[in-house]
Interface confidence: low
């Protein structure tokens, strides 16, 4: 538990006086005195304060720099910061999502297990027996080998994790 303080919750101590903190979305203009209340002013446009505070300046909303692959996920208010996310095909490099990197592609022989999001990279998995992927892709799953039998054909070349089977006509014995 927090150590007890001289003032109540949402108050601060100054000059032996307990003053009210400014509410979220407002900044401190002047401290209270024995005779006057704390004076607060709303944050300007593109500014915010997200806690009960005694800040004399509001914080600037985060700028989602398109040059870093960022876009606005949630517009900031006077009480909340802007939330940035990454453009389609990119994901954040850090906790604060301050820049983005391209999603990883899954190499041939691997398929996408989980498509990337704005905050997590592509998860790849090896194509198991019976499946293949012949492309490098951030979206393609492993595809099942073609079933030659259902086409009344036979396997002429076995499939691998990177290639499909090759089907061909059945050899028919002549009478």
């Amino acid at each position: 538990p927090e150590p007890p303080t001289a003032c109540r919750e949402k108050q601060y101590l100054i000059n032996s006086q307990c003053c009210s903190l400014c509410q979220p979305g407002q900044k401190l203009v002047s401290d209270c005195t024995e005779f006057t209340e704390t004076e607060c002013l709303p944050c300007g446009e593109s500014e915010f304060l997200d806690t009960w505070n005694r800040e004399t300046h509001c914080h600037q909303h985060k700028y989602c720099d398109p040059n870093l692959g960022l876009r606005v996920q949630q517009k900031g208010t006077s009480e909340t910061d802007t939330i940035c996310t990454c453009e389609e095909g990119w994901h954040c490099t850090s906790e604060a999502c301050e820049s983005c990197v391209l999603h990883r592609s899954c190499s041939p022989g691997f398929g996408v297990k989980q498509i990337a999001t704005g905050v997590s990279d592509t998860i790849c998995e090896p194509c198991p027996v019976g499946f293949f992927s012949n492309v490098s892709s951030a979206f393609e799953k492993c595809h099942p080998w073609t079933s030659c039998e259902t086409k009344d054909l036979v396997v002429q070349q076995a499939g691998t994790n990177k290639t499909d089977v090759v089907c061909g006509p059945q050899d028919r014995l002549r009478a």
């Epitope: 914080h59 985060k62 490099t93 850090s94 906790e95 604060a96 301050e98 820049s99 990197v101 989980q114 997590s120 990279d121 998860i123």
Partner: antibody, heavy 114, light 106 residues
Framework: QVQLVQSGAEVKKPGSSVKVSCKAS????????MHWVRQAPGQGLEWIGY????????KYNQKFKDKATITADESTNTAYMELSSLRSEDTAVYYC???????WGQGTLVTVSS | EIVLTQSPATLSLSPGERATLSCSAS?????MHWYQQKPGQAPRLLIY???KLASGIPARFSGSGSGTDFTLTISSLEPEDFAVYYC?????????FGGGTKVEIK
């Protein structure tokens, strides 16, 4: 409360490998990245890399790409860092730190000496 | 790689004095984070996102700055504040730390 407890000090021969562990408790392990940081004797801090335990995504400082391998075991809430081809220059304290760096392990001293 | 240069390398002050530590980045960063480290201990987060006080950190610590120039201020040094302080950026991979400023007793 959140705790990161690292494995004990290690003394290793040049050329060998070492695996340092970092057991997390007090929070949901898969919700936060785990970073690793190195501090050589009397030196500053160097970021090695991190792992996202929810999907095993790793990101490395290029300097440590061929030196360190970071893994995580969700079943035991433990992150690991293996250092290979050890040299005397790898002698350092290695720290794990939770995403955002508010919580750090106590550090593991790895000494490389013949 | 963004290089963080801290100055001064050593700051000799007395308890009660004000300490001003600087961190200069080789390229612009969105935020700067600050840590305190004492001998034999792990670093401790003091300030995150340039100016936000980490949990449990006394209000005598404050951070400011933007772009490439950032400052950690300790308004009135207490005996327990004598330690090494590091700045740290998470804006660009690889994440980097400054070389540290040692605040020692004069």
């Amino acid at each position: 409360q959140v705790q990161l407890v690292q494995s004990g000090a290690e003394v290793k021969k040049p050329g060998s490998s070492v695996k340092v562990s970092c057991k997390a408790s007090g929070y949901t392990f898969t919700n936060y990245w785990m970073h690793w940081v190195r501090q050589a004797p009397g030196q500053g801090l160097e970021w090695i890399g991190y792992i996202n335990p929810s999907n095993d995504y790793t990101k490395y400082n290029q300097k440590f790409k061929d030196k360190a391998t970071i893994t995580a075991d969700e079943s035991t809430n433990t992150a690991y860092m293996e250092l290979s081809s050890l040299r005397s220059e790898d002698t350092a304290v290695y720290y794990c730190a939770r995403q955002g760096f508010p919580y750090w392990g106590q550090g593991t001293l790895v000494t490389v000496s013949s | 790689e963004i290089v963080l240069t801290q100055s001064p390398a050593t700051l000799s002050l007395s308890p009660g004095e004000r300490a001003t530590l600087s961190c200069s980045a080789s390229s612009s960063v969105s935020y700067m984070h600050w840590y305190q480290q004492k001998p034999g201990q792990a670093p401790r987060l003091l300030i995150y996102d340039t100016s936000k006080l980490a949990s449990g950190i006394p209000a005598r610590f404050s951070g400011s700055g933007s772009g490439t120039d950032f400052t950690l201020t300790i308004s009135s040094l207490e005996p327990e504040d004598f330690a090494v302080y590091y700045c740290h950026q998470l804006s660009s991979d690889p994440f980097t730390f400054g070389g540290g400023t040692k605040v020692e007793i004069k």
